[in-house]
Amino acid sequence: QEGKFSGPLKPMTFSIYEGQEPSQIIFQFKANPPAVTFELTGETDNIFKIEREGLLYYTKALDRETRSTHNLQVAALDANGAIVEGPVPITIEVKDVNDNRPTFLQSKYEGSVRQNSRPGKPFLYVNATDLDDPATPNGQLSYQIVIQLPMINNVMYFQINNKTGGISLTREGSQELNPAKNPSYNLVISVKDMGGQSENSFSDTTSVDIIVTENIWKAPEPVEMVENSTDPHPIKITQVRWNDPGAQYSLVDKEKLPRFPFSIDQEGDIYVTQPLDREEKDAYVFYAVAKDEYGKPLSYPLEIHVKVQDINDNPPTCPSPVTVFEVQENERLGNSIGALTAHDSDEENTANSLLNYRIVEQTPKLPMDGLFLIQTYAGMLQLAKQSLKKQDTPQYNLTIEVSDKDFKTLCFVQINVIDINDQIPIFEKSDYGNLTLAEDTNVGSTILTIQATDADEPFTGSSKILYHVIKGDSEGRLGVDTDPHTNTGYVIIKKPLDFETAAISNIVFKAENPEPLVFGVTYNASSFAKFTLFVTDVNEAPEFSQYVFQAKVSEDVAIGTKVGNVTAKDPEGLDISYSLRGDTRGWLKIDHVTGEIFSVAPLDREAGSPYRVQVVATEVGGSSLSSVSQFHLILTDVNDNPPRLAKDYMDLYFCHPLSAPGSLIFEATDDDQHLFRGPHFTFSIASESLQNDWQVSKINGTHARLSTRHTDFEEKEYVVSIRINDGGRPPLESTVSLTVTFCSCGEDGCFRPAGHQPGIPT
């Protein structure tokens, strides 16, 4: 078959499964004169051969774990052995079969965990390797806890990340582990290849011994601090302690206050730095954080609660300079006139803000003093004697003492005696007819004027008219404002009208007074009026079920994956067509009919997450009205960014000659997301030839120390290649270079000769 099994000399790639006994040729290359024979070079491992006539074949089973790719070259030679064509690259990709079992790096692991550690934060990693291809299920490992000893009430206290092998506490473990009850646990962990999904997978087990240690990183009890303290500040109010010495403590103001009156020292003692004012702020909640020497948090922050205790430092205040009440002249003994509500800024429901009311003066004292009484705690004024006569005294002024346990304040009340409310409001019309409005009539529009009259004393609560819609408007779309001078009522639209839910509304208005009617008089039909409102349809835009739609997917989802969907309805019931707007990265497409959103390109969290686009719903037919909603696609991270140096390390130097081995610290980072445990880089010297002179040791997940192994270095620049592995799934690795100069040192560090430059003395 020309093309598949034979053909001219050109670059080619062939895939062969490992472990298969050689059974057939790989390819037959055809020679063109003057070529008469072929030559095979490269990674043949004495397995791959080529016959004189161009027959490429292999002589024994391949092993991917020995070599996963054989890079060969084939050249066509003339009769003198000179190359006349090529050499061209021929790549043999050895495809993996599951011929290796996973193996734990240790048969026993030991670790410790503090009680109350954050659930899900690994405190120990088990690690297994499988020589098979990690890009296939054959080399994809899955970890599992097989046994937990002891097991209390059948509750698992430990969990394992089946991909990373990170062992952490469960929620129950975080809450219930107690070294006083059970100081140690044993886990049996299994690892399976084939992603743990196949009956044919290979497995291995290991044992993990875990010691539970006491956690002293605990939130202290809430603190109570008296306001306006006169003691010298700062005052220690509480403390936190990290489990090991050397932590760096800081406080984080949860509420971003303009003034944050707390501090913490490096022992973990927390202080209030200035007097507090409960009336400004009655409680503070902030966090205490413990970090390592590189500024990385050691654990979750602790919440510190400070409650400010009240002292009586505020007098009562009157509601206004003069409080005005009305009383009808025929009101009976004991009737309530109104309540004086003074205020005290001290803590509510305490003695500091409990107010006492007392009338200290009444003017005029006609026909006698003591016409009014006030309820001591409620401040309610009542009629204490007989009914009042407007023609005798139309107005009374009261001076009322309002006191808390330490302060007294005088408030002033004016009581106007008004005519009795024996007349009801009477509508000019009992029927205001009907009105037709479009459903999109503006909110706030006045649609009708209504009028009732009341024969009681003008400009008093007896004659003032309040209008209410008492029937036909359960949604509260209408309201009525009253002109206080004319008692005219203006019917306004308070909420949008809606043809679809209320095409016809039979409205009933009621007119009433703020003052009660006298005994024996009641509102009758004259105080009611009706009105019919017809609402006409307006074609309205579709309505989305949500203003913002949100979805979450992994950044490595396959192209064509459904990542979310949106829904909208048209009030008139028309069909809807969906489209996207603002898909600047060209990542998405939307099904016009269903609103389902699919990926059409590779997604990248590091380019920005969430990715925000607008979705547009448009009526099909009609006037093609549309509305817009937001679609936010949250991309979860996969490990697709190799490690790199966190910054440019330009001026790394040692003073020459070295008196003792030296070291320097550098930091790595990558652009992937590191929830919970942060980055977990491992570091190694990349070149064997450098390992005699240099060593690299890990400090924490992001920092490492590069050290010299001896002192015998020349006065020159050395380039040290360091391999950084991010330990992700799959692990990504990169090689970075640090340039380290060994130089003579002056007072200001490295002294480098300037060299000859125009105009610059050396």
Epitope: P34, V36, E39, T41, Q73, A79, N80, G81, A82
Partner: antibody, heavy 119, light 112 residues
């Protein structure tokens, strides 16, 4: 045993042509290439070109491409080198040699043919 | 064309003493298959050339083992461990990596 026997000495006038033969024996003539070299008096060796008797393919040194023709007669296992438009500086000993296929070296040389170009 | 340069051009040697001839090429003769396409031969007085060393270091059949070849991609050496009277003649190096094949100028070995 393997041997190459060349034709005898030639004396030619300038502008004439000469055709030197090289008869092979002791091996399969079509398996190996035959190369032609010359050595001028007191000088080093120069490569003229080669012929592959199996298919008659030839390759020449650019310097001789327009004047030299290499041929082979497989029926008599004989290779020929013809040089045209002779000049006095073509006076030399002309050698044929077998280039050993697969080992890639000159393993057998002819005894040489002296060509003298003189007016 | 690849230029081949030999040194010395004349080499007087006492019988039983070692001798060494150098050859340099203007381009590396090492090919990706690991072979170096350099050839040494000897032309004794009045005779046709005869092979000594092929592919830089391989001793041809019938050649005494006092002859050896070595070198890198561009610098090559032919060594005779103990010169004998029959070794006199002109020694040539030749490259056959590329056409045209080219020769060194030759080194004349004579007995002191």
């Amino acid at each position: 045993q393997v041997q190459l026997v060349q034709s005898g000495a030639e004396v030619k006038k300038p502008g004439a042509s000469v055709k030197v033969s090289c008869k092979a024996s002791g091996y399969t003539f079509t398996d190996h290439t035959i190369h032609w070299m010359r050595q001028r008096p007191g000088q080093g060796l120069e490569w003229i070109g080669y012929i592959y008797p199996r298919d008659g393919y030839t390759k020449y040194n650019e310097k001789f491409k327009d004047r030299a023709t290499l041929t082979a007669d497989t029926s008599t296992s004989t290779a020929y080198m013809e040089l045209r438009s002779l000049r006095s500086d073509d006076t030399a000993v002309y050698y044929c040699a077998r280039f050993y296929y697969g080992y890639w070296y000159f393993d057998v040389w002819g005894q040489g043919t002296t060509v003298t170009v003189s007016s | 064309d690849i230029v081949m340069t030999q040194s010395p051009l004349s080499l007087p040697v006492t019988p039983g003493e070692p001798a060494s001839i150098s050859c340099r090429s203007s381009k590396s003769l090492l090919r990706s298959n690991g072979n170096t396409y350099l050839y040494w031969f000897l032309q004794k007085p009045g005779q046709s050339p005869q092979v000594l060393i092929y592919r830089m270091s391989n001793l041809a059949s019938g050649v005494p083992d006092r002859f050896s070849g070595s070198g890198s991609g561009t610098d090559f050496t032919l060594k005779i461990s103990r010169v004998e009277a029959e070794d006199v003649g002109v020694y040539y190096c030749m490259q056959h990596l590329e056409y045209p094949f080219t020769f060194g100028q030759g080194t004349k070995l004579e007995i002191k």
